[in-house]
Interface confidence: low
């Protein structure tokens, strides 16, 4: 039709120029389209170079749209991580501040001469929470053993207590329970509470990291061609007003994001596990109760030791023999005042409840992020036609789009009419991220049952059988020697998104 041959390319000029390309490339009127390699070969306003430029641009625009969606999700997860991390750190710092303020008055030299041991314990707890690969039960056991030696010496300054005698004391300790029930109670509660808190925060970190890494996965050439056809071919073919048919757009993006959709099952599992573990934040063994009142268990332990002093001394002498008297030593220590440190009434703050409520809401909202991505991008970024009618762009012309919409995920793209997807070649980065999600979900499920994955079959050298993959860089897998707590550097990067400086600040 000679009339259509001379149709003006004014609208295409406008669009092409607005994209920042040179207008000298654009024909004045339509030309024959045998040179087109992506768009259907009818009369066209696009040269080969224009088609290539627009193909590159559509590819870049889709990647930008993908990254934008990912950034919003990452920002939400990072905000959640920061809120919970601040809250948990605050609870522990608050407990340590209370201890520092009240123990000198309550216990005198029994505390002041051992302040370092208490400070080290809080540092260890902080390190553990932040993802350090140390065994919490061993850390606590070692703290009590060290404290017993020191306090026993202080309570008996008139005795000579060489190392071998103190070793014997240590061996007797388990049977004698010098600190009463406090060590056992603290061990049971602290393990559950810290494991729950740290795995929840790690879960947020892993989720954020997965989103970041997946957003960097490049879109393949087949996807680029399909997106060009979807977005700009209508312009080239002289139907610039025709918007893409909704189902057509969905098929293109389902093909382009087939690998991403395969994250769906494990992503949901992770978020479900995270919501589930928030149940462990409440009650007497909950995160808030335990982390915020470590000092009350320590006070109870020192009180128990003082109350049991005479019985304990008699039993130690019975089991370890009579120690020598220190001729230079002062007389036996007077029985000390009992440290009046009732478990502190924490005025209800509602903060953790609010944080959990918001987190649950937001995690629920992003549960179907990966499978809803094609639909979201189509409706928000692709200026779709408002209806599947015969006036929309179907990839060939203005008209109804007939093919059915594909299912989600790689396997379902076998017959995708818009994007040629090789379903036998899954993207390796995304497979790795699926594995990360699985590993973190397992950690959370273990944590729900009160177990720390890293140490379920730990041997005495402090190494663990857990995957360690919940931590997101090499700092996390570094083993921490239990003997060198005073010279240790905080392992801040075990929780993604926290800088070294921020980690130092709270330690």
């Amino acid at each position: 039709d000679p009339a259509s041959k001379s149709r003006s390319c004014g609208e295409v000029r406008q669009i092409y120029g607005a994209k920042g390309f040179s207008l000298s490339d654009v024909p004045q009127a339509e030309i024959s389209g045998e040179h087109l390699r992506i768009c259907p070969q009818g009369y066209t306003c696009c040269t080969s170079e224009m088609e290539e430029n627009l193909a590159n641009r559509s590819h870049a625009e889709l990647e930008t749209a993908l990254r934008d969606s990912s950034r919003v999700l990452q920002a939400m997860l990072a905000t959640q991580l920061r809120s919970f991390d601040d809250h948990f750190q605050h609870l522990l710092n608050d407990s340590e501040r209370t201890l520092q303020a009240t123990f000198p008055g309550a216990f005198g030299e029994l505390y002041t001469q051992n302040a370092r041991a208490f400070r080290d314990l809080y540092s260890e707890l902080r390190l553990y929470y932040r993802g350090a690969n140390l065994h919490l039960e061993e850390t606590l056991a070692e703290f009590w053993a060290r404290l017993l030696e020191r306090l026993f010496k202080q309570l008996h300054p008139q005795l000579l207590l060489p190392d071998d005698y103190l070793d014997c004391l240590g061996k007797q300790a388990e049977a004698l329970r010098p600190f009463g029930e406090a060590p056992r109670e603290l061990r049971l509660r602290a393990t559950r509470a810290f494991v729950a808190a740290r795995s929840f925060v790690q879960g947020l970190g892993v989720a954020s990291d997965v989103v970041r890494k997946v957003a960097q996965v490049p879109l393949g050439p087949e996807c680029s061609r399909a997106v060009m056809k979807l977005v700009y071919c209508a312009h080239c073919l002289g139907v610039p007003g025709a918007r893409p048919c909704p189902d057509y757009c969905r098929n293109v993006l389902k093909g382009c994001l087939a690998n991403q959709a395969d994250l769906d099952a494990e992503w949901r599992n992770l978020l479900d596990s995270m919501v589930l573990i928030t149940d462990k934040f409440w009650g007497t063994s909950g995160v808030e109760s335990v982390i915020g009142s470590v000092h009350t268990w320590l006070a109870e332990a020192i009180n128990a030791l003082q109350d049991n002093r005479d019985t304990l001394t008699a039993k130690v002498i019975q089991g370890c023999g009579n120690p020598k008297v220190n001729p230079q030593g002062p007389g036996p220590e007077e029985k000390r005042r009992r440290g009046k440190l009732a478990p502190r009434e924490r005025p209800p703050s509602g903060t953790l409840e609010k944080l959990v409520s918001e987190a649950k809401a937001q995690l629920r909202d992003v549960q179907d992020f990966w499978i809803s991505l094609p639909g979201t991008l189509c409706s928000e970024k692709m200026a779709l036609s408002t209806a599947s009618d015969d006036r929309c762009w179907n990839g060939m012309a203005r008209g109804r789009y007939l093919p059915e919409v594909m299912g989600d995920g790689l396997a379902n793209q076998i017959n995708n009419p818009e994007v040629e997807v090789d379903i036998t070649k899954p993207d390796m980065t995304i497979r790795q991220q699926i594995m990360q999600l699985k590993i973190m979900t397992n950690r959370l499920r273990s944590a729900y049952n009160g177990n720390d994955v890293d140490f379920q079959d730990a041997s005495d050298d402090g190494s663990g059988s857990g995957s360690g993959d919940g931590c997101l860089d090499d700092l996390c897998s570094r083993k921490v020697s239990r003997k060198s707590s005073s010279s240790r550097t905080p392992l801040t990067h075990a929780l993604p998104g926290l800088s070294e400086q921020e980690g130092q600040k709270t330690s």
């Epitope: 809120s83 903060t351 609010k354 409520s357 649950k360």
Partner: antibody, heavy 119, light 112 residues
Framework: QVQLQQPGAELAKPGASVKMSCKAS????????MHWVKQRPGQGLEWIGY????????EYNQKFKDKATLTADKSSSTAYMQLSSLTSEDSAVYYC????????????WGQGTTLTVSS | DVVMTQTPLSLPVSLGDQASISCRSS???????????LEWYLQKPGQSPKLLIY???NRFSGVPDRFSGSGSGTDFTLKISRVEAEDLGVYYC?????????FGGGTKLELK
């Protein structure tokens, strides 16, 4: 559909205790915190506190700390509030209220139990 | 405790009028997580309160769009664009940001 069933009225003598119930149905009881709110005749509303039925964790308005005790029975999906050392000041309507799991607001209210303290 | 002060105490209106109820808190009710947990409830005679607005300006599902909430920090407003007979009752503002959570004293919306 979600329902919170409360007995319409309770009568008690000064100095005694009363335990009022709130039976939940139409949803998973342990997933939602249950709050209690007091309304004296012709007056406004006062928040008493809440219980997390999943764990038994409670928080109270300090004003009611020695007055109210909140408990929950998971097997019967019922929340309870016990009020002790009753005086005429405790005569009021008491509502149990469900807090939304995902959004922080009171989405379902019981019909209220009218407590009359009188000798 | 955060005191929530509502004005007016009573608001006589004719059907079809616009109504506006004010609620002022004694301190900021922005929660430490950045949200403002300010809600509006309506209690009709002989009934339990019902939620209208949450987080300052979000309408609860099923609430007609003639109800709108606004404000920030310490000053909040509930507006009803065209009062209908079913809107009559006592309106309470409520803050859930700081424990203890507190209600306003109530505003009675009644016919002139």
């Amino acid at each position: 559909q979600v329902q919170l069933q409360q007995p319409g009225a309770e009568l008690a003598k000064p100095g005694a205790s009363v335990k009022m119930s709130c039976k939940a149905s139409g949803y998973t009881f342990t997933r939602y915190w249950m709050h209690w709110v007091k309304q004296r005749p012709g007056q406004g509303l006062e928040w008493i506190g809440y219980i997390n039925p999943s764990s038994g964790y409670t928080e109270y308005n300090q004003k009611f700390k020695d007055k109210a005790t909140l408990t929950a029975d998971k097997s019967s999906s019922t929340a309870y509030m016990q009020l002790s050392s009753l005086t005429s000041e405790d005569s009021a309507v008491y509502y149990c209220v469900r807090l939304g799991d995902y959004s922080y607001y009171f989405d379902y209210w019981g019909q209220g139990t009218t407590l009359t303290v009188s000798s | 405790d955060v005191v929530m002060t509502q004005t007016p105490l009573s608001l006589p209106v004719s059907l079809g009028d616009q109504a506006s109820i004010s609620c002022r808190s004694s301190q900021s009710i922005v929660h430490s997580n950045g949200n403002t947990y300010l809600e509006w409830y309506l209690q009709k005679p002989g009934q339990s309160p019902k939620l209208l607005i949450y987080k300052v300006s979000n309408r609860f599902s099923g609430v007609p769009d003639r109800f709108s909430g606004s404000g920030s920090g310490t000053d909040f407003t509930l507006k009803i664009s065209r009062v209908e007979a079913e809107d009559l009752g006592v309106y309470y503002c409520f803050q859930g940001s700081h424990v203890p959570w507190t209600f306003g004293g109530g505003t009675k919306l009644e016919l002139k």
